[in-house]
Interface confidence: low
Amino acid sequence: MMTGTIETTGNISAEKGGSIILQCHLSSTTAQVTQVNWEQQDQLLAICNADLGWHISPSFKDRVAPGPGLGLTLQSLTVNDTGEYFCIYHTYPDGTYTGRIFLEVLESSVAEHGARFQIP
């Protein structure tokens, strides 16, 4: 029986060009976490495997950093990063737990100001 629950940072927002930490925490279970997958709408971002450590997807290696803990840091954010992110905890013997985070990347007011008054 799966007794655990996933706590996440929920709905979060960040400025374009900045960075954000995605965090999930599995509680209320004694199951062993064997692997955590971080995915964004069916794209694999990163994996933290209990045996093999962190692996970052080659397409994201320049903008994704492991940690803190089992979390994930997204850097150099763009508006295209807006959307749902999932932390998928593979555990033994419970099975799989999934948490959801919605990230909204906002245009920076400084960036807007700079672009509007940029001298050619």
């Epitope: 062993q32 064997t34 692997q35 997958n37 069916d42 694999l44 994996i47 495997n49 209990a50 045996d51 093999l52 450590g53 692996h55 080659p58 593979h90 033994y92």
Partner: nanobody, 125 residues
Framework: EVQLVESGGGLVQPGGSLRLSCAAS????????MGWFRQAPGKGREGVSA???????TYSDSVKGRFTISRDNAKNTLYLQMNSLRPEDTAVYYC???????????????????WGQGTLVTVSS
């Protein structure tokens, strides 16, 4: 830390067979996929075969129908049965481990960051 040790390489005549083994140690949970790669003299490393979640397997076109990958979880060992060997199969064969992800069972080496030291297979008459 996971450690992989290959064995079973050697000299074999064309048309002959060999079975490579890869023993895994130092793991806690065993939740990972495994694959075989090879590197011929003067060439880059290429994927040969992988065994992924649910026991799914994949093979490169050059070995399909001749090589068979298998895994004995009780013995923590990966195998590669190589039949109908050809001179072009001559290479150092490496086994490698990668995280388990059900959406991916390809032979790209980019996810494989834990490697054995390799075992040499020479096919020659």
């Amino acid at each position: 830390e996971v450690q992989l040790v290959e064995s079973g390489g050697g000299l074999v005549q064309p048309g002959g067979s060999l079975r490579l083994s890869c023993a895994a140690s130092g793991y806690k949970y065993g939740v990972y996929s495994m694959g075989w790669f090879r590197q011929a003299p003067g060439k880059g490393r290429e994927g040969v075969s992988a065994i992924c979640s649910g026991g799914r397997t994949t093979y490169s076109d050059s070995v399909k129908g001749r090589f068979t990958i298998s895994r004995d979880n009780a013995k923590n060992t990966l195998y590669l049965q190589m039949n109908s060997l050809r001179p072009e199969d001559t290479a150092v064969y490496y086994c490698a481990a990668r995280p388990l992800w059900t959406g991916d069972c390809d032979l790209s080496s980019s996810w494989y960051k834990t490697w054995g030291q390799g075992t040499l297979v020479t096919v020659s008459s």
